[in-house]
């Protein structure tokens, strides 16, 4: 059974992930972002189901494409280089979902834009955080 300290650690990691995703979304939605139109042409794949930490596998598999999209944006829209930002997110996702569990992600039929994709995972983080508190 999860201890209160492990629950607290999970909550902090989810909050960190949430802040990173929100920062990316804000940077993309910045009215000065000249690459937004092109960014919105990139197809992202959404999970059929995202209710547990193991479902973060679906996010992890989209972090490569996410990094490529961020490479299009002006670096001043973000605090970190895309490579470093994605690297940080990968570390958090890996700790949250675990590296040993090989969960097979199932994707929804419909693809999403980067904005829809980020909003989906922001909602996921918020939902899990609310169950932990």
């Amino acid at each position: 059974a999860p201890t209160s300290s492990s629950t607290k650690k999970t909550q902090l990691q989810l909050e960190h992930l949430l802040l990173d995703l929100q920062m990316i979304l804000n940077g993309i939605n910045n009215y000065k972002n000249p690459k937004l139109t092109r960014m919105l042409t990139f197809k992202f794949y959404m999970p059929k189901k995202a209710t547990e930490l193991k479902h973060l596998q679906c996010l992890e598999e989209e972090l490569g494409p996410l990094e490529e999209v961020l490479n299009l944006a002006q670096s001043k829209n973000f605090h970190l280089r895309p490579r470093d930002l994605i690297s940080n997110i990968r570390v958090i996702v890996l700790e949250l979902k675990g590296s040993e569990t090989t969960f097979m992600c199932e994707y929804a039929d419909e693809t999403a834009t980067i904005v829809e994709f980020l909003n989906r995972w922001i909602t996921f983080c918020q939902s899990i955080i609310s169950t932990l508190t």
């Epitope: 990139f42 197809k43 992890e60 490479n71």
Partner: antibody
Framework: QVQLVQSGAEVKKPGATVKISCKVS????????MHWVRQAPGQGLEWIGR????????KYAENFKGRVTITADTSTDTAYMELSSLRSEDTAVYYC????????????????WGQGTLVTVSS | DIVLTQSPATLSLSPGERATLSCQAS??????LSWYQQKPGQAPRLLIY???SLASGIPARFSGSRSGTDFTLTISSLEPEDFAVYYC?????????FGQGTKLEIK
């Protein structure tokens, strides 16, 4: 169906420069990141680098930096790979291949390949 | 750089047999691994992407699996046209790296 057609075989002297082309047909080049991979005779595959033809941004493998230049001409849907200061170890088949994030998940990998261009470096 | 180690270097089997090819990553790469088949004088051909997904037009006898940083390409029942060299590739981070290849030859 996307096809990649590369330029013909080249024979170069050590110290020279070679420029190989890769023409995309069946789609526009700006839909793809164009990657270059090489294979020395009887050896494995080695990633050289890539270009985003939409904005000309490039990424190169460390051991090719300073010697390789990847470019693209969107008006002709053609990518180029130029390698300078050639040495005998550069004798290899050079392939162009694609990655895209605009279509299916499968096409995020090296799904389409050119037929390869043999570059021979010999004095 | 991420190193991919393929084993065995050569695998000698007969048509109809099951082939198991291994690729081990030097660090965690998630599912960012693909498998390619290459025949003499030809460009590589994508077989498996995202560690386990079968590329379009590839026969169902090919399958991919993953356990941590260990990846496996399995050919359930070898056909004569399957004898070739197989490479794994990681797309987790640049520089993208390939394994050194496994040559599948007829016994």
């Amino acid at each position: 169906q996307v096809q990649l057609v590369q330029s013909g075989a080249e024979v170069k002297k050590p110290g020279a420069t070679v420029k190989i082309s890769c023409k995309v047909s069946g789609d526009t080049i700006t839909a793809y990141y164009m990657h270059w991979v090489r294979q020395a005779p009887g050896q494995g595959l080695e990633w050289i680098g890539r270009i985003d033809p939409e904005d000309d941004s490039t990424k190169y493998a460390e051991n090719f930096k300073g010697r390789v230049t990847i470019t693209a001409d969107t008006s002709t849907d053609t990518a180029y790979m130029e390698l300078s200061s050639l040495r005998s170890e550069d004798t290899a088949v050079y392939y162009c291949t694609t990655v895209t994030f605009l279509y299916s998940r499968e096409l995020r990998w090296f799904a389409y390949w050119g037929q390869g261009t043999l570059v021979t470096v010999s004095s | 750089d991420i190193v991919l180690t393929q084993s065995p270097a050569t695998l000698s089997l007969s048509p109809g047999e099951r082939a198991t090819l291994s690729c081990q990553a030097s660090q965690y790469i998630g599912n960012y691994l693909s498998w390619y088949q290459q025949k003499p004088g030809q460009a590589p051909r994508l077989l498996i992407y995202s560690a386990t997904s079968l590329a379009s037009g590839i026969p169902a006898r090919f399958s991919g699996s993953r356990s941590g940083t260990d990846f496996t390409l399995t050919i359930s029942s070898l056909e004569p046209e399957d004898f070739a060299v197989y490479y794994c590739l990681q797309h987790y981070s640049t520089p993208y790296t390939f394994g050194q290849g496994t040559k599948l030859e007829i016994k």
